[in-house]
Amino acid sequence: DGPAGSWEQLIQERRSHEVNPAAHLTGANSSLTGSGGPLLWETQLGLAFLRGLSYHDGALVVTKAGYYYIYSKVQLGGVGCPLGLASTITHGLYKRTPRYPEELELLVSQQSPCGRATSSSRVWWDSSFLGGVVHLEAGEEVVVRVLDERLVRLRDGTRSYFGAFMV
Amino acid sequence: DGPAGSWEQLIQERRSHEVNPAAHLTGANSSLTGSGGPLLWETQLGLAFLRGLSYHDGALVVTKAGYYYIYSKVQLGGVGCPLGLASTITHGLYKRTPRYPEELELLVSQQSPCGRATSSSRVWWDSSFLGGVVHLEAGEEVVVRVLDERLVRLRDGTRSYFGAFMV
Amino acid sequence: DGPAGSWEQLIQERRSHEVNPAAHLTGANSSLTGSGGPLLWETQLGLAFLRGLSYHDGALVVTKAGYYYIYSKVQLGGVGCPLGLASTITHGLYKRTPRYPEELELLVSQQSPCGRATSSSRVWWDSSFLGGVVHLEAGEEVVVRVLDERLVRLRDGTRSYFGAFMV
């Protein structure tokens, strides 16, 4: 590849570098669907943005293949815990790929926050943070799931969120 | 913009890329002021550094606009709690901008760590981590606040810290 | 340095940029040695990879000096807590350098997860996440330690992991 080609590549790289893919999506009232699907996110208002990534039904969609640091935080809380609720909350980032029919676990955390509330009227708060580097191909998607999502507390987009950037 | 201009830009970009803004500030004895202000940080000693960002009264100050991954961890701990199990800790990253008189919440976490003290021992430890991508303009500042800061434990700069890097 | 030299440097930089150092290592059955050493990690299978970093006996080994965002998550859990176990778990990232005989603490977290299990037969889960930017020289190593590692739960590489990327 001659000087001209290299030059074009560098120009291209500079431009693409200017838009190194990144996104930060925030929790909203509509995030919790109760349908068993992934959490949904705000993509434009307030602190939320998409740059070189797209969004579809709760998923960050990769447009440029590479290694991404993906992260999510969820704010948990309640007054006591729902009767019969298993004492474990699972918060995870999962990959959807056209090459495989099921979601693939990427980063997962399990917590037992309800042990902190020993009576049914006790208010408690807890938080779960996940972050790590994964390889994503163009077209692959990443979603956030929380089981049991009844314990996720949403307010203003600062306490529960989901993001990624290419490294 | 002709070849020469592009060349200069690329050279410039290479140089600026060498100093991609980043910082890691560490907790110190002077971090907790008790004044209601943000936490203060060590900027030079040990693991602390500033590269392409500056510091002022607890705040990381942005010199180059862009998207930044900002993060903070605080080590929480105590012997009992001032409000018992009802004690809530709020740990947050907040933005100060010349364009708005009040601090803006960026990333926030609430925890009820005091339930971690067992009946046989009043001693407990907990940790809160926040991280996420936000857009910051030149001159804007980011600070860390913890309410109730009496529950923050400082020791050697490895347990409570605050940092950022451009993505 | 003339145009040709600059050109070569830019070409070089583009290539090195393509391999910006990054790694994500995952927990495996062999991670917990019980020997008092650091945790060991999977480097190739599943989600694990090394790019511009190497691995040796639990350690990420730096080949290119610079500032790195390093991170680790460990999944904690148990049924009650081991008799006589101090209620504190320490999870940390530590640096090994040829210039100093002892490991240096980089990022550390202490938690008291066992307070969440109110009876000796109660199942509990907790998670600890650490992440921050540190400067690492070529040849320096970073390891993860957890005390008491009996409380680390491994399953499939998604719950306990260790990674880094250059910023």
């Epitope: - | 012997v79 409000l83 018992g84 009802a86 021992s121 009043r122 001693v123 | -």
Partner: antibody
Framework: QVQLVQSGAEVKKPGASVKVSCKAS????????MNWVRKAPGQGLEWMGR????????NYNQKFMGRATFTVDRSTSTVYMELSSLRSEDTAVYYC????????????WGQGTLVTVSS | DIVMTQSPDSLAVSLGERATINCKAS??????????MNWYQQKPGQPPKLLIY???NLESGVPDRFSGSGSGTDFTLTISSLQAEDVAVYYC?????????FGQGTKVEIK
Amino acid sequence: QVQLVQSGAEVKKPGASVKVSCKASGYTFIDHIMNWVRKAPGQGLEWMGRIYPVSGETNYNQKFMGRATFTVDRSTSTVYMELSSLRSEDTAVYYCGRGSYYWNAMDYWGQGTLVTVSS
Amino acid sequence: DIVMTQSPDSLAVSLGERATINCKASQSVDFDGDSYMNWYQQKPGQPPKLLIYSASNLESGVPDRFSGSGSGTDFTLTISSLQAEDVAVYYCQQSIEDPWTFGQGTKVEIK
């Protein structure tokens, strides 16, 4: 200024119960723990337990578990200590002591309430 | 329970002289570099008064002739120059673990 004012002296028969009040003023009542401590004649100080006015949560010294009950009335900024199944060795001065800002010491005390248990 | 043992049981010191009271805990009362040890003064007919918290911190309004030191299991209360109004019983108290426990008290008198 901070004040803790306790109810007056009581004389009770063995097996009876006594309820001592401690009314707080001069500070934000719910922000501080309230402890109960007693001093029997010729004895040292003995911690009975604490109550968190914000929630009503209580912690008791095992020695008094089942006999002591701490309650709070936030509307009047008053905490109460009730001790049941009284015996002669419960004869003592009972104090309420406010938890300090750093909550693991008692920085203000009530004047004390003498409870005499006698048949 | 953590047992707190004070020595001596009583102490007679001349006005203006130093008075030293020791307190030994049956186990460490330290946590993360802080000692959960307090000292109180009690005069006849009065409630206890906080003098020192966290082993060495002087409570607001307490004269600076009072000082505290120590860590782990061994602690000391010092009155650098005894005054007549210092005649009282002094108690140490641990707050690292429930139940909070006090020493048996040290009676300080004028010689």
